[in-house]
């Protein structure tokens, strides 16, 4: 069950999709990717306060146990719930190929 | 791609499965769960250093960008890669029923 979307920490502070611009050099891809030269990387960043976008029962348990044992159990973490595909044009031994990656760009986020 | 399983931080410090014993009271379930009285909660805890158990391309990107922009991009996070099912015997409006939860106990872990 996807729980509350209201962030008690203030606007934009809780787990949500962010876009980070990165060059091929930033990503360590310059030697094998031809295009694009720059990637708008969508990723999940932000805090996961109690029951905010809890992905599932496990996330709810984690919240409860983190409250009781913060030194032992970490708070839930903001991670992708799904991904958008992206195409990279890459160098291969035989030339150039177009490859689709299904797990590269976050589409939306939840806490787990 | 599941990347390296060698933890550079020392044994047991990196992302792995831990078991935390929790009572119904700990979990906030005492008013709706009859059995079990105590749950051995398996969860994913530990650090995610560079490429350790990287779940996918997104995790690899996150590692690269965290190295470049640690204040903006968090390190990958240790989360369940899969779950073990578990049953709870619970109270409902119509009586007692046994319900299977597929997303309650972590089975194994990765970094994302």
């Amino acid at each position: 069950a996807r729980n509350g979307d209201h962030c008690p920490l203030g606007p934009g502070r809780c787990c949500r999709l962010h876009t980070v611009r990165a060059s091929l050099e930033d990503l360590g891809w310059a030697d094998w990717v031809l295009s694009p030269r720059e990637v708008q990387v969508t990723m999940c960043i932000g805090a996961c306060p109690s029951q905010f976008r809890a992905a599932n029962m496990h996330a709810q348990i984690k919240t409860s146990l983190h409250r009781l044992k913060p030194d032992t159990v970490p708070a839930p973490c903001c991670v992708p719930a799904s991904y958008n595909p992206m195409v990279l044009i890459q160098k291969t031994d035989t030339g150039v190929s177009l490859q689709t990656y299904d797990d590269l760009l976050a589409k939306d986020c939840h806490c787990i | 791609a599941r990347n390296g399983d060698h933890c550079p931080l020392g044994p047991g410090r990196c992302c792995r499965l831990h078991t935390v014993r929790a009572s119904l009271e700990d979990l906030g379930w005492a008013d709706w769960v009859l059995s079990p009285r105590e749950v051995q909660v398996t969860m994913c805890i530990g650090a995610c250093p560079s490429q350790f158990r990287a779940a996918n391309m997104h995790a690899q990107i996150k590692t690269s960008l965290h190295r470049l922009k640690p204040d903006t991009v968090p390190a990958p996070c240790c989360v369940p890669a899969s779950y073990n099912p578990m049953v709870l015997i619970q109270k409902t409006d119509t009586g007692v029923s046994l319900q299977t939860y597929d997303d309650l106990l972590a089975k194994d872990c990765h970094c994302i």
Epitope: - | L34, S35, P36, N84, M86, V87, I89, L98
Partner: antibody
Framework: QVQLQESGPGLLKPSQTLSLTCTVS??????????VSWIRQPAGKGLEWLAH???????RYNPSLKSRLTISKDTSKNQVSLKLSSVTAADTAVYYC???????????WGQGTTVTVSS | DVVMTQSPLSLPVTLGQPASISCRSS???????????LEWYLQKPGQSPQLLIY???NRLSGVPDRFSGSGSGTDFTLKISRVEAEDVGVYYC????????FGQGTKLEIK
């Protein structure tokens, strides 16, 4: 939906070993909290609990029959088996398998298989 | 072993009238975890048993509310507020706190 189906030899001779199989569907034998018990009922008599196997392969037996009983499971086949050695006429009964949760909660039962021990 | 003793063994009841079955355990069936694992089953003629009551007093989903369970320690009771024709069969108490055992059964029949 959840189903359990017992199968057995029907007729045995005294001193033989009874082998029973319970094939389950609609749930997994590795689900935490679930297990399967064998329970028997001689004609016109009450229920007698025999053995239980938990999701984690932990086993429990009726102490009065423990030396003759062996319970096991094959999760890949969704089957739970029971062996009862050195049978006598007193082991003639309908044998049921039942799904259990934690310390009881037998919410689904098979229809039972009749076993007769006779020379 | 824990012995579960039911009474009466035979219970003739008039339709619409209440019925009560007692179950006594030879020792306390409060588990070390605090649970009292006492259950009631009904076996209708020609059928497999069916679970009615879980942990002394918790009616299973779908079980009519004319069935109720009570008790603690070693003494437990199943009550039917108004017996209906479909309630005919043998009622068993069961304990799962120690080595699992059933009571010897109480046969409910219509007068």
């Amino acid at each position: 939906q959840v189903q359990l189906q017992e199968s057995g030899p029907g007729l045995l001779k005294p001193s033989q070993t009874l082998s029973l199989t319970c094939t389950v569907s609609g749930f997994s034998l590795i689900t935490s909290g679930l297990g399967v018990s064998w329970i028997r009922q001689p004609a016109g008599k009450g229920l007698e609990w025999l053995a239980h196997i938990y999701w984690d392969d932990d086993k429990r037996y009726n102490p009065s029959l423990k030396s003759r009983l062996t319970i096991s499971k094959d999760t890949s086949k969704n089957q739970v088996s029971l062996k009862l050695s050195s049978v006598t006429a007193a082991d003639t009964a309908v044998y049921y398998c039942a799904r259990g949760g934690y310390d009881g909660y037998y919410d689904y039962w098979g229809q039972g298989t009749t076993v007769t021990v006779s020379s | 072993d824990v012995v579960m003793t039911q009474s009466p063994l035979s219970l003739p009841v008039t339709l619409g009238q209440p019925a009560s079955i007692s179950c006594r355990s030879s020792q306390s069936i409060v588990h070390s975890n605090g649970n009292t694992n006492l259950e009631w089953y009904l076996q209708k003629p020609g059928q497999s048993p069916q679970l009615l009551i879980y942990k002394v007093s918790n009616r299973l989903s779908g079980v009519p509310d004319r069935f109720s369970g009570s008790g603690s320690g070693t003494d437990f009771t199943l009550k039917i507020s108004r017996v209906e024709a479909e309630d005919v069969g043998v009622y068993y108490c069961f304990q799962g706190s120690h080595v699992r055992t059933f009571g010897q059964g109480t046969k409910l029949e219509i007068k």
